[in-house]
């Protein structure tokens, strides 16, 4: 079920890549983020908390991500025609609870001017 | 129905502590985490903190760090909100508010009917 | 601290009447949730994620905005609907509750 758009701005472009913003609600302690290109899992993220608060972030499907305490970014690199998709961000909420997911995302458009290696 | 009872009205002398309960019932008290919210005469609302109940985790506000205590007792679905070093400032209506989540965010979807708390010499 | 201001302070107006209540936000925010209370009462949840109505509330109630300017809409006034009126922001620690807009009789 896709619970809608995502409310702020998903995706930036920089050479020639694109960071994939994907953001939870900072209470959030432990979480699973996985970003989907249309129905295919490419990336994933689970952030869990142990005792003594000890945090431990692990990637089954690993992209190269970065982890604030409101947002998961997944960046993907050499940017072509294909990358043009609808993108989601998957999220599972486990703690605190109640266990939520959520699916938000949106299409991501490909142009010329983002396009890793131009021919000139 | 999902329902959150909170203790009777308390009178503190400023310096002491207060424990306030908040006993869940009409749902599984694990699957939800707890806030506390006071709300003092006449004044607007504010958040003291959060505690899950599935992992005892806790979130204070940090005006409350230090001086604000959250435990839970599984056995009897109770939340504890204890507040110490009492002042006048604290006299307050203190109020339990179950978790939940939208899309994007999270909110207080089930209230408790409220605590007073009086701090006075 | 994300300071929500909340406008106007009191709303005069009759049954049947259009209500509109601002919340501005002293910094982006992602969403809003508008609380309802009445004298004595907790407080009880109308608007989530800035405007999902939540369970039993009336279709009167609508909710709008982005970024820091966000409304609560009620289409048309009904008696139990004077009360106060409450933004609460959960975006930004520590998550923060405007002043409140009184709506009161006319």
């Known amino acids: 079920e896709i619970n809608g758009s995502a409310n702020y701005e998903m995706f930036i472009f920089h050479n020639g890549g694109v960071q994939i913003l994907c953001k939870y609600p900072d209470i959030v302690q432990q979480f699973k983020m996985q970003l989907l290109k249309g129905g295919q899992i490419l990336c994933d993220l689970t952030k869990t908390k142990g005792s003594g608060n000890t945090v431990s972030i692990k990637s089954l499907k690993f992209c190269h991500s970065q982890l604030s305490n409101n947002s998961v970014s997944f960046f993907l690199y050499n940017l072509d025609h294909s990358h043009a998709n609808y993108y989601f961000c998957n999220l599972s909420i486990f703690d605190p609870p109640p266990f939520k997911v959520t699916l938000t995302g949106g299409y991501l458009h490909i142009y010329e001017s983002q396009l890793c290696c131009q021919l000139k | 129905q999902v329902q959150l009872v909170q203790s009777g009205a308390e009178v503190k002398k400023p310096g002491s502590s207060v424990k306030v309960s908040c006993k869940a019932s009409?749902?599984?008290?694990?699957?939800?985490?707890m806030h506390w919210v006071r709300q003092a005469p006449g004044q607007g609302l504010e958040w003291i903190g959060l505690?899950?109940?599935?992992?005892?985790?806790?979130n204070y506000n940090q005006k409350f760090q230090g001086r604000a205590t959250m435990t839970v007792d599984k056995s009897t679905s109770t939340a504890y909100m204890e507040l110490s070093s009492l002042r006048s400032e604290d006299t307050a209506v203190y109020y339990c508010?179950?978790?939940?989540?939208?899309?994007?965010?999270?909110?207080?979807?089930?209230w408790g009917q409220g605590t007073t708390v009086t701090v006075s010499s | 601290e994300i300071v929500l201001t909340q406008s106007p302070a009191t709303l005069s107006l009759s049954p049947g009447e259009r209500a509109t209540l601002s919340c501005s936000a002293s910094s982006s925010v992602s969403y809003m949730h508008w609380y309802q209370q009445k004298p004595g009462q907790a407080p009880r949840l109308l608007i989530y994620d800035t405007s999902k109505l939540a369970s039993g509330i009336p279709a009167r109630f609508s909710g709008s905005g982005s970024g820091t300017d966000f409304t609560l809409t009620i289409s048309s006034l009904e008696p139990e609907d004077f009360a106060v009126y409450y933004c609460f922001q959960g975006s930004g620690y520590p998550y923060t509750f405007g002043q409140g807009t009184k709506l009161e009789i006319k």
């Open positions: 505690i899950s109940i599935y992992s005892d985790h806790t």
């Open positions: 009409g749902y599984t008290f694990t699957d939800y985490a």
């Open positions: 508010g179950r978790n939940n989540y939208g899309n994007y965010g999270w909110y207080f979807d089930v």
